[in-house]
């Protein structure tokens, strides 16, 4: 750092004063010197270091008419909004010829009410769940003693006796306010007041009670909600995707969930209008007057298979001599599961019904024994899934095929490996 030389008398006739104040104060330090000849530039030092970006103004007043006469030079350093970084020893410095002169020092100090570096923040917490709040204040002057308050009531018997920077709250059962007082020799500063909103705890043990092809009954255990009764619970169901998304841990499903509200108690809900034999993910959150709990994790569930809701369509049954040709199309109504096959039943007047499992084929050729004279022969077809048979079609009479009519293509297809069915009473 530059040092003054004592070979010549110091040109300074006025030295910087002292400033002590609170944060944000604006003040000015002033230096005055008298020199002969061209006035020098006045530099400012803080703690021995030149201030490169000082907010200083320099005024020069000639004492004579000649340039070589004496000049009065005044330099003023403005400190705006005093901060801790502004504190220290201030001096003026000038270079005159080959010599350096430094003024007597002035001091800038910061002293005021405590200043908060950190204040408690608003937040939501689940009922009876521990959490921490932070508060940090500084002087000068130090020390700064903190006193936490909950709902305006001190949490310790005196400042500095309780928790200081971090307050650990073991749990709340009602929405509360927290603030922090900072005490030092100059006075007291109070932090902002943080509102801690108590929400219900996340529900637990979400599980299936019963399953139907298009509806699921689910139940859960509510979490604690403090002094605030639960008003309702909300259940969301979403179609499970292809293994990404929910299963990969994403918080929200890609498509819009199906949302249902349940009055509570009971903590149970029947979810309807679902697709049969379909994987879903479900979750639940419960709400009090203070707001909703967090959602449970997504629970994978699946609706069971149902039976087909309608019979096979467009059943056609014709007879040509000792052969009967029957064909049909898949039911238009929802299958409610994986189609496993078809059952066919035929019956003549005053004869027992014969039941056949056709498998997944949609046509069958029956070999009729005898002269096929049984009258009023009718055929019914039903589709089935693992859950059981769907509704049977209305009986279709077996019509004789008349030459000249186009024979359907499917009637040319025989069953080579299937043994012919016979009517034992023919």
């Amino acid at each position: 750092a530059p040092r003054g030389t004592q070979a010549e008398e110091s040109p300074f006739v006025g030295n910087p004063g002292n400033i002590t104040g609170a944060r944000g104060l604006t003040g000015t330090l002033r230096c005055q010197l008298q020199v002969q000849g061209e006035p020098p530039e006045v530099h400012w030092l803080r703690d021995g270091q030149i201030l490169e970006l000082a907010d200083s103004t320099q005024t020069q007043v000639p004492l004579g008419e000649d340039e070589q006469d004496d000049w009065i030079v005044v330099s003023q350093l403005r400190i705006t909004s005093l901060q801790l970084s502004d504190t220290g020893q201030y001096q003026c410095l000038v270079f005159l010829g080959h010599q350096t002169f430094v003024s007597q020092p002035g001091y800038v100090g910061l002293e005021g009410l405590p200043y908060f570096l950190e204040e408690p923040e608003d937040r939501t917490v689940a009922a009876n769940t521990p959490f921490n709040l932070s508060c940090q204040a500084q002087g000068p002057p130090e020390p700064v003693d903190l006193l936490w308050l909950q709902d305006a009531v001190p949490l310790a018997t005196a400042p500095g006796h309780g928790p200081q920077r971090s307050l650990h709250v073991p749990g709340l059962n009602k929405t509360s306010s927290f603030s922090c007082e900072a005490h030092n020799a100059k006075g007291v500063t109070t932090s902002r007041t943080a509102t801690i909103t108590v929400l219900p705890q996340q529900p637990r043990n979400l599980h299936l009670v019963s399953r139907q092809p298009t509806e699921l009954e689910v139940a859960w255990t509510p979490g604690l909600s403090g002094i605030y009764p639960l008003t309702h619970c909300t259940l969301q169901a979403v179609l499970s995707d292809d293994g990404m998304g929910i299963q990969a841990g994403e918080p929200d499903p890609p498509e819009e969930p199906l949302t249902s509200q349940a009055s509570v108690p009971p903590h149970q809900l029947r979810l309807g209008s679902l697709h049969p034999h379909t994987p879903y993910h479900i979750r639940v959150a419960c709400t009090s007057s203070q707001g909703p709990s967090s959602w449970t994790h997504w629970l994978p569930v699946e609706t069971p298979e149902g039976v087909p809701l309608g019979p096979p369509e467009n059943i056609s049954a014709t007879r040509n001599g000792s052969q009967a040709f029957v064909h049909w199309q898949e039911p238009r109504a929802p299958l409610q599961g994986t189609l496993l096959g078809y059952r066919l039943a035929y019956q003549g007047q005053d004869t027992p019904e014969v039941l056949m499992d056709i498998g997944l084929r949609q046509e069958v050729t029956l070999e009729l024994q005898g002269d096929g004279s049984v009258s009023n022969l009718t055929v019914c077809v039903a589709a089935y899934t693992a859950a059981g048979d769907g509704p049977w079609s209305l009986p279709v009479p077996l019509e004789a095929w008349r030459p000249g009519e186009a024979q359907p293509v499917h009637q040319l297809v025989k069953e080579p490996s299937t043994p012919a069915f016979s009517w034992p009473w023919w």
Epitope: T157, P159, H161, H183, K186
Partner: antibody
């Protein structure tokens, strides 16, 4: 520099009221809490009570019916009054900030006729 | 009231010794405990606050430990200026109560 100084009579007659004042310099009594502690000769320390920066008070229940702590913010002083004193109240009385960073040097009050 | 029991009531030790003083509260006081040193004719001096926090300007040979109802003040290497009486104070509840003191004397 923070300093606390107790002042008041060193001798009080039985049944009279003991009055002490603590003058604080370098620290505003409108911040923090300010207390009185006493120590009978050759014995341990006993907490008497305190006054808060806002002027509310807390007293040791064993003395509560006889004790009063007040303040004068314009003089940056707080005071102790203990009524109906007996020889058992003979002690060195200390004033202190309740964080106990700063204490007065103590003043001996003797209760005797 | 919360009772504070200090032990021992006095002890003799030599310079360089490790000295331990204990303080037991009659109920849980968390860490609302302070330790003081008092020399004859002087006001007590704060050593430890919050059961474990060394006060400004106190040598690091002093340390505090404990929480709940059992607390310890340890002087790791006793120095000549440490011969004094030591007190604990609970400030968890009003009335604040001091231990009866432990006098550390020269052996």
């Amino acid at each position: 520099q923070v300093q606390l100084q107790e002042s008041g009579p060193g001798l009080v007659k039985p049944s009279e009221t003991l009055s002490l004042t603590c003058t604080v310099s370098g620290y505003s009594i409108t911040s923090n809490y300010w207390g009185w502690i006493r120590q009978p000769p050759g014995k341990g320390l006993e907490w008497i009570g305190y006054i808060t920066y806002s002027g509310s008070t807390s007293y040791n229940p064993s003395l509560k019916s006889r004790v009063s702590i007040s303040r004068d913010t314009s003089k940056n002083q707080f005071s102790l009054k203990l009524s109906s004193v007996t020889a058992a109240d003979t002690a060195v009385y200390y004033c202190a900030i309740t964080t106990f960073y700063y204490w007065g040097q103590g003043t001996l009050v003797t209760v005797s006729s | 009231d919360i009772q504070m029991t200090q032990s021992p009531s006095s002890l003799s030790a030599s310079v360089g010794d490790r000295v331990t003083i204990t303080c037991r509260a009659s109920q849980d006081i968390g860490n609302y405990l302070r330790w003081f040193q008092q020399k004859p004719g002087k006001a007590p001096k704060l050593l430890i606050s919050g059961a474990t926090n060394l006060a400004a300007g106190v040598p690091s040979r002093f340390s505090g430990s404990g929480s709940g109802s059992d607390f310890t003040l340890t002087i790791s290497s006793l120095q000549p200026e440490d011969f004094a009486t030591y007190y604990c104070l609970q400030s968890k509840e009003s009335p604040w109560t001091f231990g009866q003191g432990t006098k550390v004397e020269i052996k």
